[in-house]
């Protein structure tokens, strides 16, 4: 194929790949008709003047995962057709001025995972056709004004995983075509008002894992096309009332891992497209009426690992499409009987790790599609008669680690568990806590003939009792709810996967569906 270097492989499709530790310089001679060249995992430490001079038809050049620390300014001379250039995962600390001069066709420039200490306006001033610029995983401490002023066609800019402590409000002002801006994992403490005003086409803004304490009220008011906003793992303690008011296209908002103490009614919205709202690991203590009422299409609401002790009966008004509600690991002692009444499409609810002492008989009365209820590790001694009767799709119920009182009043719950066991998975069985003569015994195998008569009047539900085990040939499909593998945080759907750390941390939100989380 027009002379392929021995250290490389060359395909008929004009693709050349050179890999291996024994390569210490750009191999020669490279086929003159090469359109794609990859130099990966070598010991090349520098690029000298014009090593690619004879392959002017090159469209894509990947020089990744090498020992590259020095590049001569004329290294990419004569590559006027080059559209894609990656220098990612090398050891570059400095970029020579003029390095990208003459790369008039360049659309994607990947400089991620190096050791770059600074960038200057002159670095990219010739790259007027650039659409994608990846600078994440470097050591940048600031971005000078004008650094991106010539990149008017830029649609994706990743500055994540650097050491940025502040951002100038003018640095992005000319990026009117930008769709994706990533600033995650820096040291930003605040974002000046107006920083994002020029980004009228922005669809994704990633600000997670910084140290942001305050959001300016109008910070996002010009970003009407924003679809994904990641604000998790910051120090945000309050949300200005109008901060999310102008985001009608938003479909993903993460606020977990902040210091939010309260949520005011109407703070979210209108956001007719928001499907998921992640608020776990904050300091929220109560939920007022109508706090989520603008989120008509919300399907996933994660409020776990807060300090919620009170939920107003109308807190979940408007959430008619909600499928998953996570309230686990809070301080709930009581729930109003109507609190879930509007959640007609709810499938999974996690209430474990609270202090619930009792549940109203009608708590799930209107939530007929529930498939999973998690109530383990509360202070429940019994449950009202008929509480699950109408839940024909229920196929996971967790009740263990509660102080069940196994007197005669427990019989309806015991019978329900026994008669419905094929629908309820094989989780840990509930165990009696009292009276003393049955402590430690499984609730479903206590000897009913020595069960102590109750000394109080059991609660009777106010809604009609209906059979919960309808006489059908088979139980509901227990595979309809997937495994309980849970993810630590929303996977923030990046093409550069360096930020994603998926774990199997069952403690985070305790749902039954593995969310892209």
């Amino acid at each position: 194929y027009h002379g392929c270097p021995s250290e490389c492989t060359c395909s008929r499709a004009s693709q050349v790949e050179c890999t291996g530790a024994r390569i210490v310089a750009v191999p020669t001679p490279l086929p003159w008709n090469a359109m794609s060249l990859q130099i990966l995992n070598t010991h090349i430490t520098e690029l000298n003047e014009s090593p690619f001079l004879n392959i002017s038809a090159l469209i894509a050049l990947r020089i990744e995962k090498n020992e590259l620390s020095r590049i001569t300014p004329g290294a990419f001379r004569n590559l006027g057709s080059l559209r894609y250039l990656s220098l990612a995962n090398n050891k570059l600390q400095v970029l020579p001025i003029g390095l990208f001069q003459g790369l008039d066709s360049l659309e994607s420039l990947l400089l991620s995972s190096n050791q770059l200490l600074q960038i200057q306006p002159a670095h990219f001033s010739q790259c007027s056709n650039l659409k994608e610029l990846q600078l994440h995983g470097n050591h940048l401490e600031y971005i000078p004004d004008g650094a991106f002023d010539h990149l008017v066609g830029l649609t994706k800019l990743n500055l994540g995983k650097n050491s940025l402590t502040h951002i100038s409000p003018r640095v992005f002002q000319h990026l009117g075509n930008l769709q994706v801006l990533r600033l995650y994992e820096n040291r930003l403490t605040d974002i000046p008002m107006g920083t994002f005003d020029g980004l009228v086409n922005l669809q994704e803004l990633a600000l997670q894992q910084n140290q942001i304490g305050l959001l300016s009220p109008g910070l996002f008011h010009n970003n009407h096309n924003l679809q994904r906003l990641y604000l998790s793992n910051n120090h945000i303690s309050q949300l200005p009332p109008s901060v999310f008011m102008q985001l009608p296209q938003l479909n993903r908002l993460t606020l977990f891992g902040n210091s939010l103490k309260e949520l005011s009614p109407g703070i979210f919205g209108p956001m007719p497209n928001l499907r998921e709202l992640w608020l776990y690991d904050n300091h929220i203590s109560s939920l007022p009426d109508n706090v989520f009422s603008n989120l008509r299409q919300l399907q996933v609401l994660i409020l776990s690992r807060n300090q919620i002790s009170f939920i107003s009966p109308g807190a979940f008004n408007g959430l008619t499409e909600l499928r998953e509600l996570s309230l686990h690991t809070n301080a709930l002692q009581d729930l109003d009987g109507n609190v879930f009444r509007m959640l007609a499409n709810l499938q999974n609810i996690s209430l474990q790790n609270n202090r619930l002492r009792q549940l109203p008989g009608n708590i799930f009365a209107n939530v007929n599609g529930l498939m999973a209820i998690q109530l383990q590790n509360n202070q429940l001694e019994n449950l009202p008669l008929g509480i699950f009767d109408h839940l024909g799709k229920l196929c996971e119920l967790r009740l263990y680690d509660n102080p069940w009182r196994c007197d005669s009043d427990i019989l309806p719950l015991r019978n329900w568990l026994l008669l419905n066991q094929p629908r309820l998975g094989t989780d840990t069985v509930p165990v009696c806590f009292s009276p003393a003569n049955v402590r430690g015994q499984s609730l479903i195998i206590i000897n009913v003939n020595v069960a102590v008569p109750s000394v109080h009047v059991p609660e009777v539900p106010s809604y009609p009792e209906t059979p919960w085990y309808p006489d059908t040939p088979s139980y509901p499909d227990t595979t309809s709810v997937s495994s309980t593998t849970e993810l630590t945080s929303p996977v923030e759907d990046y093409t550069d996967l360096t930020t994603i750390q998926v774990t199997d941390d069952r403690s985070v939100w305790g749902m039954t569906q593995a969310q892209s989380g």
Partner: antibody, heavy 113, light 111 residues
């Protein structure tokens, strides 16, 4: 003490129906399941159905021919069998609780022309 | 349906000796870590009587000489010291899922 008192023996013709009863005493009727079990002469035991708070579950072999009902005010469970044949001649027991911990004395059904 | 197979069909044991009856289920009858296997005794002309529930728990008023063991698919009823009043037919039964099914029975006699 817990007791399940079943109705007396029945002699019926093929094609007819029969309704037998099981009256519970000595415990809270609504707190326990009532099962029905069939035993043909000299044979083993076969589960028919259960009823609990008006909810029922049937063995497919008896679906459509056995109907379980109960009267909470009299603490009595009933089983009706229809379209009877000689194969239905058997002793029918009611039993209490999920684990069948107490049994009635049985109702003998004879189907003969 | 879960099929329950008892063995032996009949068993003759001397008074005071141990009697062992086996029961095998066609699939596991375990749930929640509990085996939903029950044993009943039926004497001639009488209804069955619950001896053992959930594999190893004694029913009310059942003498200590009756014990149950096993998990999954294989279970055993043991009469540690056979008494004359133990002459009966013994049935195993699974209550893991509907239809609840019984074994064919084991007749225990005095040798």
């Amino acid at each position: 003490q817990v007791q399940l008192q079943q109705s007396g023996p029945e002699l019926v013709k093929p094609g007819a129906s029969v309704k037998m009863s099981c009256k519970a005493s000595g415990y809270t009727f609504t707190s326990f399941v009532i099962h029905w079990v069939k035993q043909m002469p000299g044979q083993g035991l076969e589960w028919i159905s259960y009823i609990y708070n008006d909810g029922t579950k049937y063995n497919e072999r008896f679906r459509g021919r056995a109907t379980l009902t109960s009267d909470k005010s009299s603490s009595t469970a009933y089983m009706e069998l229809n379209s009877l044949t000689s194969e239905d001649s058997a002793v029918y027991y009611c039993a209490r609780d999920y684990y069948f911990d107490y049994w009635g004395q049985g109702t003998t059904l004879t189907v003969s022309s | 349906d879960i099929v329950m197979t008892q063995s032996p069909d009949s068993l003759a044991v001397s008074l005071g000796e141990r009697a062992t009856i086996n029961c095998r289920a066609s699939e596991s009858v375990d749930y929640y870590g509990i085996s939903f296997m029950n044993w009943y005794q039926q004497k001639p002309g009488q209804p069955p009587k619950l001896l053992i529930y959930a594999a190893s728990n004694q029913g009310s008023g059942v003498p200590d000489r009756f014990s149950g063991s096993g998990s999954g698919t294989d279970f055993t009823l043991t009469i540690s010291s056979l008494q004359a009043e133990d002459v009966a037919v013994y049935y195993c039964q699974q209550s893991k899922e509907v239809p609840y099914t019984f074994g064919g029975g084991t007749k225990v006699e005095i040798k």
